[in-house]
């Protein structure tokens, strides 16, 4: 079995303030079992943007139906973008663990820049 890769195809995405930003991410394999999460930033101070397993993220919608069998697309859309949303976003695959899931592999990151709202 080929080892799972986390693919974030875009190094950067530029969005006008007030619009939605689509951040793309897909896996090359269904194995190992475990959730994906999106973070802004890296390291200990990173901010959780979306957790496939649990939580309430009102501005985030998934582009594909994550519950669909064999789904490999974990792209998200973030609505009503503001300058405060600028940063680098990482799609991270976790391996199912007990008691806690363990980080398995991260995508290379997508830098989101925010343009001024067109007048």
């Amino acid at each position: 079995e080929d080892e799972l890769q986390v693919i974030q195809p875009e190094k950067s995405v530029s969005v006008a303030a007030g619009e939605s930003a689509t951040l793309r991410c897909a896996m090359t394999s269904l194995i190992p079992v475990g959730p994906i999460m999106w973070f802004r930033g890296a390291g200990a101070g990173r901010e959780l943007i979306y957790n496939q397993k649990e939580g309430h993220f009102p501005r985030v919608t998934t582009v594909s139906e994550l519950t669909k069998r064999n789904n490999l697309d974990f792209s998200i859309s973030i609505s009503n973008i503001t300058p405060a949303d600028a940063g680098t976003y990482y799609c991270v695959k976790f391996r199912k663990g007990s008691p806690d899931d363990v980080e398995f592999k991260s995508g290379a990151g997508t830098e989101l820049s925010v343009r001024a709202k067109p007048s």
């Epitope: 080929d2 890769q5 195809p9 793309r24 582009v63 490999l72 792209s75």
Partner: antibody, heavy 122, light 108 residues
Framework: EVQLLESGGGLVQPGGSLRLSCAAS????????MSWVRQAPGKGLEWVST????????YYADSVKGRFTISRDNSKNTLYLQMNSLRAEDTAVYYC???????????????WGQGTTVTVSS | EIVMTQSPGTLSLSPGERATLSCRAS???????LAWYQQKPGQAPRLLIY???SRATGIPDRFSGSGSGTDFTLTISRLEPEDFAVYYC?????????FGGGTKVEIK
């Protein structure tokens, strides 16, 4: 420069066989799914078949299932399409194409060859 | 099997005009799996838009894609002489990776 070069087309009688090849260069061939797409004279594009980077997964259009076989030799950076029991309706230009990312069938095909012509006629 | 229907079949416009091409899926699909291609006579197709709305490398910003669910649109904001061609949408992700029938954008 990323390039795909098809070969192996020609004139064949109905019921005959042909093997198309696609030589790839300029990218890590084994990391990407590859596809064959055809276009009959004056018609639109028709997806034929796709193979994963490792060669472990293959996908076919119903119109060619059981007659065509897609394969790849990653050591030679070459994609193949073995076409058996050919019919007049298989007459077309056959293009090989590279998937945009390592994920099979996700975002589209970003590099295409110039095509090779297959004519099935008696 | 999901059917992709493109309309209109032919669009007759002048350079500088705006072109709006439609692609409709017979059932709801994920936008990540919708691509648009341009094909000129005697040439191979070229990827324009992936993921319904993202421009491929080197594609001018006069090309834009939008849509979700069953209805997708390719817009060319101001037609340049080199934009007159046939445009195809494609559904990826599942097998078969179905193409629409194409829209020919011709000079009026």
């Amino acid at each position: 420069e990323v390039q795909l070069l098809e070969s192996g087309g020609g004139l064949v009688q109905p019921g005959g066989s042909l093997r198309l090849s696609c030589a790839a260069s300029g990218f890590t061939f084994s990391s990407y799914a590859m596809s064959w797409v055809r276009q009959a004279p004056g018609k639109g594009l028709e997806w034929v078949s796709t193979i994963s980077g490792s060669g472990g997964s293959t996908y076919y259009a119903d119109s060619v299932k059981g007659r065509f076989t897609i394969s790849r030799d990653n050591s030679k950076n070459t994609l193949y399409l073995q076409m058996n029991s050919l019919r007049a309706e298989d007459t077309a230009v056959y293009y090989c194409a590279k998937d945009f990312t390592e994920v099979v069938g996700w975002l589209g095909m970003d590099v295409w060859g110039q095509g090779t012509t297959v004519t099935v006629s008696s | 099997e999901i059917v992709m229907t493109q309309s209109p079949g032919t669009l007759s416009l002048s350079p500088g005009e705006r072109a709006t091409l439609s692609c409709r899926a017979s059932q709801s699909v994920s936008s990540s799996y919708l691509a648009w291609y341009q094909q000129k006579p005697g040439q191979a197709p070229r990827l324009l838009i992936y993921g319904a709305s993202s421009r491929a490398t080197g594609i001018p910003d006069r090309f834009s894609g939008s849509g979700s669910g069953t209805d997708f649109t390719l817009t060319i904001s101001r037609l340049e002489p080199e934009d007159f061609a046939v445009y195809y949408c494609q559904l990826l992700g599942s097998s078969p990776r179905t193409f629409g029938g194409g829209t020919k954008v011709e000079i009026k």
